[in-house]
Interface confidence: low
């Protein structure tokens, strides 16, 4: 089961996989959780009774029984991986560590005003895993205010030592705070000729990219498909890096594909979750168990439920096509990937879904959308909520989007007349307003957070967060939408939809069924021409047709402008304002969410 508490002065005996250095027991737990095999760990804290060379060591452990004997040891802190836990897991660590030096390859040293400036530099430097900053009090004058950016092969320090007047910390790339670009293209018939830092077996280029994305040092990759001429290299995924951060040479070779790590937008792409099935494919690895099950989906479930299982192969028996059972081979390896991939043997293979919780829930696929029509169907926009006010009577006030299990993103102008969060109700998983009865469950609002610079919708900063009184459980009907990535600022979204229960025309009424409209994005320059009397800033985004027609309207405010990119829906805009509704030459104006990522992340992490 899930055990989150740490055990003080306790050491787990045996089961060692590897030893790394971490600045705290909590960070050791994070490293263990993200390691393919680690289930338990022991961390050696700074302690007078311990040899200082052992301080800050984090020993990652595995056990067939999922537990190990406990021994009393002063200064040792032990605990369990979060792999066994149902909750979301993030690799983000915003802490800084005073009087600690984290050792690694120093590749850049420059003057910074303070620790935060140094951390920001690390976050926006492609190679940086962590940093050490020497403050202005540092004894050696030439090192004062120096920010050292560092990397190691595994992303963790090679050693950690005590040193006064320095501060260390980690890159915040995994907190979605990096400005580095995300290159999402996969290039066919391309080999990148650079240093291989590792190689693994993968069934396709997408799995290869995901493996590259969660490997701390991989910046780009080359994948040899199953049709690659050299048999021994088929299904080989080469993880690569270079000094510049970009491939130095591209070679044209058929049956090879190459691409880039998505590390700086990993909060909005699946990195750990490989949910596809690979037909006529066998994954080889260390066998954990063989079970008789009905079908490959049941086999995947068995693997997901078995804590140590990383991947599986289902072998249908000749009778299984008539409803019989087949053999389910549960497997594991040292790195979480198959040791070999074979084709043409009739097996169906795949990966555990247990690691899916390490990805943002917003990246999981939703039901296919109904094309055409203006009325939505159940589960089509599961992040859309209807915000009701109860004063003077209960009515739909605004739309909003689920971005976290306790967070709704909406427009600030929705609260111009709202005195208190007590009168607000959030209804999720709703298609028709008539579904809402007295007995319909809702989420109360604990807190309204309006952007400090908001004055009125038309001048911008029309953004607000609602913190719910209780956390919501995600289902097919209610789940979050991904925030866009800073690294995706230059992406041209082509599949965008505005949704809401708002009026269908200016002098209209709230609609019963959630409406949807496909709208093209309009450039800021184009939009500025249409709104001469207003200042259209880069913090706004416009969408709509020149000829008018499809648009957001009264009652849609605060709702999402959702754009699908690479199979993942992103919250690109928040319905804010416009001249009339669906008027010719008057696009709708939306709050440009990517420009508020820092604000959203700080507010949701701070409260």
């Amino acid at each position: 089961g899930c055990i989150t508490e740490l055990l003080a002065d306790t050491c787990f005996q045996g089961g060692d996989i590897t030893t790394v250095f971490t600045p705290s027991a909590k960070h050791c737990q994070l490293v263990c959780t993200h390691h393919p095999r680690c289930l338990l760990f022991t961390f050696m804290a700074e302690s007078p009774s311990q040899d200082p060379t052992k301080w800050f060591t984090c020993i990652l452990k595995d056990s067939v029984t999922e537990t190990l004997p406990r021994v009393n040891m002063t200064g040792a802190i032990s605990g369990y991986s979060f792999k066994q836990c149902p909750h979301q897991i993030s690799a983000c660590n915003r802490n800084v560590y005073v009087d600690l030096v984290m050792k690694g390859m120093n590749y850049n040293g420059s003057i910074a005003r303070n620790v935060q400036e140094c951390q920001e530099r690390c976050t926006n430097s492609v190679h940086c895993h962590f940093f050490t900053y020497a403050t202005s009090q540092f004894p050696s004058a030439e090192h004062r205010n120096v920010c050292l950016l560092k990397y190691t092969e595994m992303g963790t320090p090679t050693r950690i030592t005590k040193l006064s007047m320095v501060v260390s910390g980690f890159s915040l790339k995994s907190c979605a705070l990096s400005n580095l670009a995300c290159i999402r293209d996969i290039f066919p018939s391309t080999v990148f000729a650079d240093n291989n830092i590792d190689s693994v077996m993968a069934p396709d280029a997408f799995v290869c990219r995901r493996i590259c994305t969660h490997h701390p040092s991989c910046l780009f990759f080359t994948f040899f498909s199953q049709e690659w001429p050299k048999e021994s290299e088929r299904n080989l995924c080469l993880l690569k890096t270079s000094e510049s951060g970009l491939p130095s040479t591209r070679i044209k070779k058929h049956k090879a594909l190459s691409g880039f790590s998505l590390q700086s937008c990993r909060h909005s792409v699946p990195v750990f979750c490989h949910s596809s099935f690979y037909h006529n494919t066998d994954f080889l690895g260390e066998e954990l168990d063989i079970v008789d099950v009905k079908g490959h989906e049941a086999c995947q479930k068995m693997c997901t439920d078995a804590i140590r299982c990383q991947f599986f192969t289902y072998s249908p028996s000749p009778e299984s096509c008539h409803g019989g059972k087949g053999k389910c081979y549960l497997k594991l390896s040292s790195n979480g990937s198959p040791t070999k991939i074979l084709h043409g043997r009739g097996g169906i293979s795949g990966y555990t879904l247990r690691l899916c919780k390490m990805d943002n829930v917003c990246t999981t696929k939703i039901k296919p959308r109904i094309v055409g029509g203006t009325a939505s169907v159940h589960g089509e926009w599961p992040w859309q909520i209807t915000l009701h006010t109860t004063s003077p009577i209960r009515r739909h006030l605004c739309g909003g989007s689920i971005i976290g299990n306790q967070w709704i993103l909406t427009a600030a102008h929705c609260f111009d007349q709202v005195e208190s969060p007590k009168i607000l109700r959030v209804y999720s998983g709703i298609l028709n307003q008539t579904e809402i009865k007295k007995s319909t469950s809702f989420f109360g609002v604990q807190k309204i957070i309006i952007h400090d610079q908001y004055e009125e919708a038309e001048s911008g900063y029309d953004i607000a967060l609602l913190k719910l009184e209780t956390a919501m459980n995600y289902t097919d009907a209610q789940r979050p939408i991904c925030l866009p990535s800073k690294g995706d600022r230059n992406v041209i979204y082509t599949d965008c939809w505005v949704t809401g229960w708002g009026y269908r025309r200016l002098a209209g009424e709230i609609q019963n069924t959630l409406q949807k409209a496909n709208v093209p994005l309009v450039t800021t320059e184009e939009c500025q021409i249409r709104y001469k009397g207003h200042k259209i800033t880069n913090k706004m985004i416009c969408a709509g047709y020149r000829e008018g027609g499809k648009d957001a309207c009264k009652g849609d405010s605060g709702g999402p402008l959702s754009c699908k990119h690479n199979e993942v829906w992103h919250l690109v805009g928040i319905t804010s304002w416009g001249e009339g509704c669906g008027q010719r030459e008057r696009p709708g104006v939306y709050t440009n969410v990517v420009e508020y990522l820092d604000w959203i992340l700080k507010k949701t992490q701070a409260v």
């Epitope: 802490n95 800084v96 935060q116 009090q137 400090d452 820092d598």
Partner: antibody, heavy 116, light 107 residues
Framework: QVQLEESGPGLVAPSQSLSITCTVS????????IYWVRQPPGKGLEWLGM???????DYNSALKSRLSISKDNSKSQVFLKMNSLQTDDTARYYC??????????WGQGTTLTVSS | DIVMTQSHKFMSTSVGDRVSITCKAS??????VAWYQQKPGQSPKLLIY???YRNTGVPDRFTGSGSGTDFTFTISSVQAEDLAVYYC?????????FGGGTKLERL
């Protein structure tokens, strides 16, 4: 041990200039930033500006045009100069040493009254 | 410039109580917040820096937490000598700035 001591004129007429000296001991000015902070009677603390170990300066935006901070490392002294004084500049003026961006050692402060 | 707001100018407490003082930054200041104690006629004294690190010699009843824009300073069990004015300060971006102060007084 670490000490900071402010010395100033005590009384200044409106529109005149002010010069306060902060003399430090127990540490070197090349290794530490020094801040100036003031506190009007019965009110809160206001950050005026600072001089970094390497001589760079930063100022409170509202007072930038009237403030100047300099130092003499060899004499272990930091100087705050402020011109065009008004009655609302009446306050206790402190210097303090930088510690991870905060202020770990403070002087006792010197009281300035701006009055005709 | 970053504005630091301490919403309570005064807080009443009794010896042995747990008390929390909040401070809000107008923009993200990461974890760069310090807390000071000032008693009448004395210079301010640094208690906490970088949100949660206690200065040398500061009793462990004083703790700090938060990140981004919302910060909290807590005294787990108030002692008579803790009655004073407490200030928060951001040291993220110059010009650095203080909160308006919270006076902790006897109930």
């Amino acid at each position: 041990q670490v000490q900071l001591e402010e010395s100033g004129p005590g009384l200044v007429a409106p529109s005149q200039s002010l010069s306060i000296t902060c003399t430090v001991s127990g540490f070197s000015l090349t290794g530490y930033g020094i801040y100036w902070v003031r506190q009007p009677p019965g009110k809160g603390l206001e950050w005026l500006g600072m001089i970094w170990g390497d001589g760079r300066t930063d100022y409170n935006s509202a007072l930038k045009s009237r403030l100047s901070i300099s130092k003499d490392n060899s004499k272990s002294q930091v100087f705050l100069k402020m011109n065009s004084l008004q009655t609302d500049d009446t306050a206790r003026y402190y210097c303090a040493r930088d510690y991870y961006g905060s202020k770990d050692y403070w002087g006792q402060g010197t009281t300035l009254t701006v009055s005709s | 410039d970053i504005v630091m707001t301490q919403s309570h100018k005064f807080m009443s407490t009794s010896v042995g109580d747990r008390v929390s003082i909040t401070c809000k930054a107008s923009q993200d200041v990461s974890t760069a917040v310090a807390w000071y104690q000032q008693k009448p006629g004395q210079s301010p004294k640094l208690l906490i820096y970088l949100t949660s690190y206690r200065n040398t010699g500061v009793p462990d009843r004083f703790t700090g937490s938060g990140s981004g824009t919302d910060f909290t300073f807590t005294i787990s069990s108030v002692q008579a000598e803790d009655l004073a004015v407490y200030y928060c300060q951001q040291h993220y971006k110059t010009p650095y700035s203080f909160g308006g102060g919270t006076k902790l007084e006897r109930l």
